[in-house]
Every structure is written in structure tokens, then in C-alpha cells.
């Protein structure tokens, strides 16, 4: 293994070297959602395609029951886009009861669940007021950032209203993560 | 430095180690677009600056004729932002004929062309209805995600209407990819 | 043309190997902003949380006085999201004097400051016209891309109007960078 020593003396290496192709990675794509129960005060979670088309999981990054399972501690870049679409001829039509003067909105949250911590942690949130004049509207919310995760953490994507999610194409709504 | 060899036997390395600085990478920036032919049913492709200002290509990642050329198989993070701007005093003014009740829209697609598949593959799409009341409007669409690409694949960015793309500044409209 | 076949990727290693866990990285999160002086013709810079909650800096990447300090030359992925919110019942209410027919807007700029260069460099800009009919509006602008940075460079996030930035939650407004 001598030839693979990284030896230049100025180089401080504090962690073992590892092959990039061996890092946990996943890109999940949208599927048609089935209405599911969700906790009060918590937005419903999307479920995902993990192996067909553009979707994949690799190197011990697994997907199960709406969650990406983190197999190894480290810093991960996590991203998601959700495309929403709705039909409304004026703002007031999709206004929820009891919300006078508060605009309608669409929200995406990437959430971390840790067994050792009772409350889910919101890592990323994209939220947008919607007050479209046209009869049909559609728009994406994109999120992405780096987080330090622990082995065993679980990631999910929550949305304010599952019925507004565009599930028609794998390139419009997606969710991914990779170890840096 | 012998002890710093990456040899610990518990470490499964399934791929050859390689220096990060040697990985294919590119960040391309907007230039003024010239109208070009494009396939029926396919949005026109943008062309890009690849060496001036903030733009660069490195480590065998090349740009030619609207395409980023993938020199090595692997997992890439691909991203683009396109800033659109238009002028309209009401929604109906930029409405295309024959599209009653369908909102005007702006769309960005990152497309992969591969020799092993006759159809270009849409990797990422950002699409947004536009129904602006103001006389001038502008807004960005951002996309980014990870994909498994093959040596020889080509990437391009397609837009719904080239004439609406803001080509004035390199920080407003851009396209990039890097091997993870 | 034999030479134009792409060479096996595992062979040419032009840079020393280094452990991924040792790379400079930071994720900063929003704090309540205090009004600060800023240069004429330059948007004000946000300041950030760098160690509490989801925020961190590591491996010689430091945060000081609104700036992320780049400790090592290389290619970095840089990202930010700023969530804006405002109150207006019609477009004209937040219109600045002397800007007839020009839409109100929100803008985020990620800026690089280099000691050896007199002018800051705008790396990324997200700018959006705002003409909301509803009485309260809110929306994010997300940016992210890869840039070649030099040791000693400083990064900051500038916004068009600090008073419109949503500083209430660390997942809504953030700024990060990591060495690739």
C-alpha cells in the first residue's frame, strides 16, 4: 500500500481516506400520494420512488416508509424540490376557514427524526404565500443545504397540503441526500 | 507516516481512491442567446460562457455547442438557475393563442442526452405559472440534484422561451455540474 | 482519434489525496438583524449564527463579522436561502419614490471579497419582482453553485432590504459553503 500513502508532510489528514464511489447517496422521485394519517400540528410526509427511472439508493443509504435512513455519521448535502399546482379563480377560494387576512400558502419542510430526541428537527423550510389570479397555478419550491447527521437518523419531506403536490413527473418533485 | 496509510482492515473501499482536485467540474454562465433551431416538442437549449469571468471547465469536463460533456461515469451534482424577465400589463397579454384558461408559464429543464437511449431524458424541471399584474416582472427558477451519469453523456439546459431569459449578468443565470 | 477516447478515470491523480472529513465546511443560520451602515450602491450584508442549533463551522472555515473566511484554495459549493416577508395590500404601497412603472423587488446576492481586488464580486444573484395582492406575503429565494475560491477570500450574503428578511427560524434563512 506504500504507493497509496498520501504522504506529503504538510497535509493534515484527521480522518481515514475513503473512496467517493462508496459513499451513501440517494435520489428519490415523486409517486402518486395516498392520503395518510399524520400527527396533529405536523405536515404530512411524502412517500417516494427509490429504484425506478432516475431514482436510486446506494451504499447502505436505504429508503423505507417515507424515510431516508442515514447509515453513517457525517456531513450530508440534502435537497428537495416539490412542485405544487392548484386551481383557484381568486385568492379567497382556497382560503382556510378562520384565517382572515392571512394569505394561503404552500410549504415544504425537510425534517430529521432522531431516535434519541423526542421531537423531529426541521432542517429546511421553504414557504410561500399563494395568491394567484389565474385559474390554474403551479410553482416549485427548492431547498438544499448541508447538515451533520448521525448514523440512524431518518429524513423525510413534509408538505402543507399533499393534494397540491404535482406527482406527474419524476423531474418535478424529488428528494435526495449524499455524504460529502 | 506509515500509520496514516488508509489500511485499517475494517475499512471497505470498493472503488479506487482519487484526488478531489482531479474531478470533472464546470460552472457555466449566461451569454446573449442567438435564436437556434430546436426539435419540435422540445424547448430550445441555452448556450453558455465556459471560460470568462466566473465560468470554468476543468478535468476533462468540456463544453461545446450547448452541451456539457461528461468525461467519466459516476454520480454528479447538477444545478442551474435561469432568471426570466418579461413585460406585461395583464396576464392575457403574453397568453399564447389557443390556450384559454391555461396560465402563461416559464420552464427550465435540465436534459441528458445519451447514446444508449433515443429520447433525451429530462433530469430536472422547474416550471411556474406567470400571471403578473405589474408591467415588468422578473424571477429566477433554481434546480439542483444528483444523478448517475455515464461517460459520453451530454447535458443541456432547455427553456420554454429564450426571449424571456435574463442574459445581462453572469450571477443571474448559470449552469454547472461536478463529480461527487 | 484514439486519443479522444476518455482515459480510465482511476489512473490520473494530479493532486494529493485528502480525507473528506477534514475539508472546510460551514452552515450558518439566520439571527435577528441589527440595522447597520452599508456602502452606498451596495446592499446590506446579513449576519449569522455560526454555532448554535443547526449552525456550525469546521476545519478552519471561520465566521466573523458577516463574513465566511475561506481557509484553503479550491472549488467550493456555496448556497443560501433567504425568506422574505412583507405586508402590503397593493403593489404601489411598498413602491419606492421615483420608481414609477418599475416593480418592487426582493434580491439576494452572494458576494466574494478578495483583498487583492478592489471591488467585491457578485457570485450569485436571485432577484424577484414582488407585486402581491394579498395583505401579507412571504417567499424564499434559493441560490447555490460552485466557485473556485482562494485562501483568504471572504463570502457574505447581501439583501435588498434587511427589514423584509424572515429571521424567525433557522430553517428558513441560511448560508453555507463547503470545499468539494
Amino acid at each position: 500500500l506504500k504507493g497509496q500513502e498520501f504522504a506529503p508532510s504538510h497535509q493534515q489528514v484527521y480522518a481515514p481516506l475513503r473512496a467517493d464511489g462508496d459513499k451513501p447517496r440517494a435520489h428519490l422521485t415523486v409517486v402518486r400520494q395516498t392520503p395518510t394519517q399524520h400527527f396533529k400540528n405536523q405536515f404530512p410526509a411524502l412517500h417516494w420512488e427509490h429504484e425506478l427511472g432516475l431514482a436510486f439508493t446506494k451504499n447502505r443509504m436505504n429508503y423505507t416508509n417515507k424515510f431516508l435512513l442515514i447509515p453513517e455519521s457525517g456531513d450530508y448535502f440534502i435537497y428537495s424540490q416539490v412542485t405544487f399546482r392548484g386551481m383557484t379563480s381568486e385568492c379567497s377560494e382556497i382560503r382556510q376557514a378562520g384565517r382572515p387576512n392571512k394569505p394561503d400558502s404552500i410549504t415544504v419542510v425537510i425534517t430529521k427524526v432522531t431516535d434519541s430526541y423526542p421531537e423531529p428537527t426541521q432542517l429546511l423550510m421553504g414557504t410561500k404565500s399563494v395568491c394567484e389570479v389565474g385559474s390554474n397555478w403551479f410553482q416549485p419550491i427548492y431547498l438544499g443545504a448541508m447538515f451533520s447527521l448521525q448514523e440512524g437518523d431518518k429524513l423525510m419531506v413534509n408538505v402543507s397540503d399533499i393534494s397540491l403536490v404535482d406527482y406527474t413527473k419524476e423531474d418535478k418533485t424529488f428528494f435526495g441526500a449524499f455524504l460529502l | 507516516l506509515k500509520g496514516q496509510e488508509f489500511a485499517p482492515s475494517h475499512q471497505q473501499v470498493y472503488a479506487p481512491l482519487r484526488a478531489d482536485g482531479d474531478k470533472p467540474r464546470a460552472h457555466l454562465t449566461v451569454v446573449r442567446q442567438t435564436p437556434t433551431q430546436h426539435f419540435k416538442n422540445q424547448f430550445p437549449a441555452l448556450h453558455w460562457e465556459h471560460e470568462l469571468g466566473l465560468a470554468f471547465t476543468k478535468n476533462r469536463m468540456n463544453y461545446t455547442n450547448k452541451f456539457l460533456l461528461i468525461p467519466e461515469s459516476g454520480d454528479y451534482f447538477i444545478y442551474s438557475q435561469v432568471t426570466f424577465r418579461g413585460m406585461t400589463s395583464e396576464c392575457s397579454e403574453i397568453r399564447q393563442a389557443g390556450r384559454p384558461n391555461k396560465p402563461d408559464s416559464i420552464t427550465v429543464v435540465i436534459t441528458k442526452v445519451t447514446d444508449s437511449y433515443p429520447e433525451p431524458t429530462q433530469l430536472l424541471m422547474g416550471t411556474k405559472s406567470v400571471c403578473e399584474v405589474g408591467s415588468n416582472w422578473f424571477q429566477p427558477i433554481y434546480l439542483g440534484a444528483m444523478f448517475s451519469l455515464q461517460e459520453g453523456d451530454k447535458l443541456m439546459v432547455n427553456v420554454s422561451d429564450i426571449s424571456l431569459v435574463d442574459y445581462t449578468k453572469e450571477d443571474k443565470t448559470f449552469f454547472g455540474a461536478f463529480l461527487l | 482519434l484514439k486519443g479522444q477516447e476518455f482515459a480510465p478515470s482511476h489512473q490520473q491523480v494530479y493532486a494529493p489525496l485528502r480525507a473528506d472529513g477534514d475539508k472546510p465546511r460551514a452552515h450558518l443560520t439566520v439571527v435577528r438583524q441589527t440595522p447597520t451602515q452599508h456602502f452606498k450602491n451596495q446592499f446590506p450584508a446579513l449576519h449569522w449564527e455560526h454555532e448554535l442549533g443547526l449552525a456550525f463551522t469546521k476545519n478552519r472555515m471561520n465566521y466573523t463579522n458577516k463574513f465566511l473566511l475561506i481557509p484553503e484554495s479550491g472549488d467550493y459549493f456555496i448556497y443560501s436561502q433567504v425568506t422574505f416577508r412583507g405586508m402590503t395590500s397593493e403593489c404601489s404601497e411598498i413602491r419606492q419614490a421615483g420608481r414609477p412603472n418599475k416593480p418592487d423587488s426582493i434580491t439576494v446576492v452572494i458576494t466574494k471579497v478578495t483583498d487583492s481586488y478592489p471591488e467585491p464580486t457578485q457570485l450569485l444573484m436571485g432577484t424577484k419582482s414582488v407585486c402581491e395582492v394579498g395583505s401579507n406575503w412571504f417567499q424564499p429565494i434559493y441560490l447555490g453553485a460552485m466557485f473556485s475560491l482562494q485562501e483568504g477570500d471572504k463570502l457574505m450574503v447581501n439583501v435588498s432590504d434587511i427589514s423584509l428578511v424572515d429571521y424567525t427560524k433557522e430553517d428558513k434563512t441560511f448560508f453555507g459553503a463547503f470545499l468539494l
Epitope: - | K40, V113, S116, Y117, P120 | -
Partner: antibody, heavy 116, light 106 residues
Framework: QVQLQESGPGLVRPSQTLSLTCTVS????????IHWVRQRPGRGLEWMGR????????KYNPSLKSRVTITRDTSKNQVSLRLSSVTAADTAVYYC?????????WGQGSLVTVSS | DIQMTQSPSSLSASVGDRVTITCRAS?????MYWYQQKPGKAPKDLIY???NLASGVPSRFSGSGSGTDFTFTISSLQPEDIATYYC?????????FGQGTKVEIK
């Protein structure tokens, strides 16, 4: 409309080099990939290789790699095939074909006979 | 190399019959492609990426399968379908074709 047209000599002497040109029209050559496929008399189809005209990047059938060269001239909308050291076993109809567009297209084929 | 084994090598069926051709790859592939070649003509795309109908191809043609086993079907054979049909995989190098199935009318 999309067209691919093979051209070249119909007769090549043994041990010489076979040269064919594929001229395309109706699409941007650099947007796609061009393949060469041959069909020997009474036999099936054999993929010879392909070029990405945008980059010049080529892939060849390993069984032919030592003898085949594919190049492109985007200014003329042409892709060329050269097969060296031919024998009678190289007698075939040679097709150029496109992939990477909305549909694949094939040329009509060019019969090349190797004979002295 | 990925070898493609196509069967049968020839078949004879009546107009209106359902015709099935199979193709087996020596290694798993993501997609299979099917072509039709009439005597003296260039091959024509029929099915791409296993199950997608190429532009202008009648709906009586279909494809299915995954991994190593793929199937091409003509749901109701027509006189104009007399031709040789080839499968092809595009993933390994070389891009290999099956040896062809010649379809005739009884």
C-alpha cells in the same frame, strides 16, 4: 425532415481501407450521436461504433477497435467511417444511424463489396 | 460482452394471430430495444427503452420485460408485418443485437 445518407465506393480491394461518409440533414448533428452498423449478406446486424459529434468522443466495438476509426466534420454535417485491412468478410451493407434525438433514424445503407 | 439470444429464429403465423418474440441477455440490462427490418430496407425503430412505442408505430406492437428476459409482441399480425425483428441492448460495449427473428404469414 431528418435524413441520413451514406456514400462511398461500392468496391474495395482486400487489404485496403474502406471509407464511407454519412451526411445528415434536418437536425443539428451535434445534438445527437451517430452510429455505424453493418449487415453482412444473410446475417444479422453488427454495431461497429459511435461518435458524439459535439465532442469527437468515440466508442468502438472491441472486436473491430484495431481497424475502425470514426470521425466527424460538423461544418459539413458529416460523419466518416474508416475500416482498415479489409477482407471479403467485411462485405456488407453499412448503415449510419442517429440516437439521442426524439426518434432514432437510419440511413438507407450502402453496400460495400470487398473483392479483388 | 453481453450476448443476446433471440428466439425463435423464425416463425409463421396467420393474419390476426398474436406473435411473441423473446430476447435473453447474458447479463442484466436496464432496457431493450426492438427493430423491424424489411427485405432490402434499413432497420426501423419499433420499441425503445423496453416498452415505449417509437413515433408513428402502430399500437399492436408492444414490449415488456426486465433484467435479462424481454418480450416483443404483435397483438394482431398484419400482412405488412412480414419482416425480420431484432432486439438490441445499448448498455454494454459492444451494443449487441440479437440474431433476428424472421416473421412470415402462413
Amino acid at each position: 425532415q431528418v435524413q441520413l445518407q451514406e456514400s462511398g465506393p461500392g468496391l474495395v480491394r482486400p487489404s485496403q481501407t474502406l471509407s464511407l461518409t454519412c451526411t445528415v440533414s434536418g437536425f443539428d448533428l451535434q445534438d445527437t450521436y451517430i452510429h455505424w452498423v453493418r449487415q453482412r449478406p444473410g446475417r444479422g446486424l453488427e454495431w461497429m461504433g459511435r461518435i458524439d459529434p459535439a465532442s469527437g468522443h468515440v466508442k468502438y466495438n472491441p472486436s473491430l477497435k484495431s481497424r475502425v476509426t470514426i470521425t466527424r466534420d460538423t461544418s459539413k454535417n458529416q460523419v466518416s467511417l474508416r475500416l482498415s485491412s479489409v477482407t471479403a468478410a467485411d462485405t456488407a451493407v453499412y448503415y449510419c444511424a442517429r440516437s439521442g434525438g426524439m426518434t432514432d433514424y437510419w440511413g438507407q445503407g450502402s453496400l460495400v463489396t470487398v473483392s479483388s | 460482452d453481453i450476448q443476446m439470444t433471440q428466439s425463435p429464429s423464425s416463425l409463421s403465423a396467420s393474419v390476426g394471430d398474436r406473435v411473441t418474440i423473446t430476447c435473453r441477455a447474458s447479463f442484466s440490462v436496464d432496457y431493450m430495444y426492438w427493430y423491424q427490418q424489411k427485405p432490402g430496407k434499413a432497420p426501423k425503430d419499433l420499441i425503445y427503452a423496453t416498452s415505449n412505442l417509437a413515433s408513428g408505430v402502430p399500437s399492436r406492437f408492444s414490449g415488456s420485460g426486465s433484467g435479462t428476459d424481454f418480450t416483443f409482441t404483435i397483438s394482431s399480425l398484419q400482412p405488412e408485418d412480414i419482416a425480420t425483428y431484432y432486439c438490441q441492448q445499448w448498455e454494454g460495449n459492444p451494443r449487441s443485437f440479437g440474431q433476428g427473428t424472421k416473421v412470415e404469414i402462413k
